[in-house]
Interface confidence: medium
């Protein structure tokens, strides 16, 4: 069981792990799942230009401002 199993065992998340080092230019589409009934953490699923889907860390520097804008309507703080 991964880290999510202990913390989030009551809930169901899409992402079991995140992929590091993905270049933004490789991404064709981004889905952001806010905390909700299904999962107690923010999840980011990226569709890549090669057809694969991966999970990204919402804290990744190139994503952070985008995620904040989506979740907080432009608020700067996380």
């Amino acid at each position: 069981a991964g880290p999510a199993a202990a913390v989030l065992r009551e809930l169901r998340c899409v992402c079991l792990q995140t992929t590091q080092g993905v270049h933004p230019k490789m991404i064709s589409n981004l889905q952001v799942f806010a905390i909700g009934p299904q999962c107690s953490k923010v999840e980011v699923v990226a569709s890549l230009k090669n057809g694969k889907e991966i999970c990204l860390d919402p804290e990744a520097p190139f994503l952070k401002k985008v995620i904040q804008k989506i979740l907080d309507g432009g608020n700067k703080e996380n």
């Epitope: 880290p3 913390v7 009551e10 905390i35 909700g36 009934p37 107690s40 953490k41 979740l71 309507g73």
Partner: antibody, heavy 119, light 107 residues
Framework: QVQLQQSGAELVRPGTSVTISCKAS????????IVWVKQRPGHGLEWIGD????????FYSENFKGKATLTADTSSSTAYMHLISLTSEDSAVYFC????????????WGQGSLVTVSA | DIKMTQSPSSMSASLGERVTITCQAS??????LSWYQQKPWKSPKTLIY???RLADGVPSRFSGSGSGQDYSLTISSLESDDTATYYC?????????FGAGTKLELK
């Protein structure tokens, strides 16, 4: 700017109940978890429970089941904690806090609400 | 419940000194460890989360390290504003549990 504004100090009698509020601003209330923490002198910090303010999910420490009830009013972006059957052991400062991007850490804290239980 | 053993319980250090506080979990918490600073009569302030990540607005002299059961918070060069009590928190398993705290004072 993220802010959590808690209600003021309360002096209450043993056996009664109290409700503490935590008004959130500066972010989308329903996108994060709100946690409640108890602090008594000499006892450090103790997790009471948390709730997903978008509705439906509330978790409690075994120590606070039957003692604390956590609710939220999304229309006013306010979280509440109701404590019942108060004793001197419940005299403490109670903090609310907002999660980061998941439940596992507390990014922003309220200023605390002092509850004193005394006859 | 997971027990967090924090040490030392209190310490004093000189300005500019390197300070390290440790927390040991009773079992593997997989880096679900955060650190908080609290000054008297104030609410806690988040310093570090996921064991190593610096929270927004926290000076770079603070850093976190560790994995598995053993974690530490380091202040690379102590400043007067750093006198406070420091707490670790594990959220690897419910319920989350705090360490007992480390009171840091200036020599």
């Amino acid at each position: 700017q993220v802010q959590l504004q808690q209600s003021g100090a309360e002096l209450v009698r043993p056996g009664t109940s109290v409700t503490i509020s935590c008004k959130a601003s500066g972010y989308t209330f329903t996108n994060y978890w709100i946690v409640w923490v108890k602090q008594r002198p000499g006892h450090g910090l103790e997790w009471i429970g948390d709730l997903y303010s978008g509705g439906g999910y509330t978790f409690y420490s075994e120590n606070f089941k039957g003692k604390a009830t956590l609710t939220a009013d999304t229309s006013s972006s306010t979280a509440y904690m109701h404590l019942i059957s108060l004793t001197s052991e419940d005299s403490a400062v109670y903090f609310c806090a907002r999660s980061g991007y998941d439940r596992t850490w507390f990014a922003h804290w309220g200023q605390g609400s002092l509850v004193t239980v005394s006859a | 419940d997971i027990k967090m053993t924090q040490s030392p319980s209190s310490m004093s250090a000189s300005l500019g000194e390197r300070v390290t506080i440790t927390c040991q979990a009773s079992q593997d918490i997989e880096s679900y460890l955060s650190w908080y600073q609290q000054k008297p009569w104030k609410s806690p302030k988040t310093l570090i989360y996921y064991a190593t990540r610096l929270a927004d607005g926290v000076p770079s002299r603070f850093s976190g390290s560790g994995s598995g059961q053993d974690y530490s918070l380091t202040i690379s060069s102590l400043e007067s504003d750093d006198t406070a009590t420091y707490y670790c928190l594990q959220h690897g398993e419910s319920p989350p549990t705090f360490g007992a705290g480390t009171k840091l004072e200036l020599k």
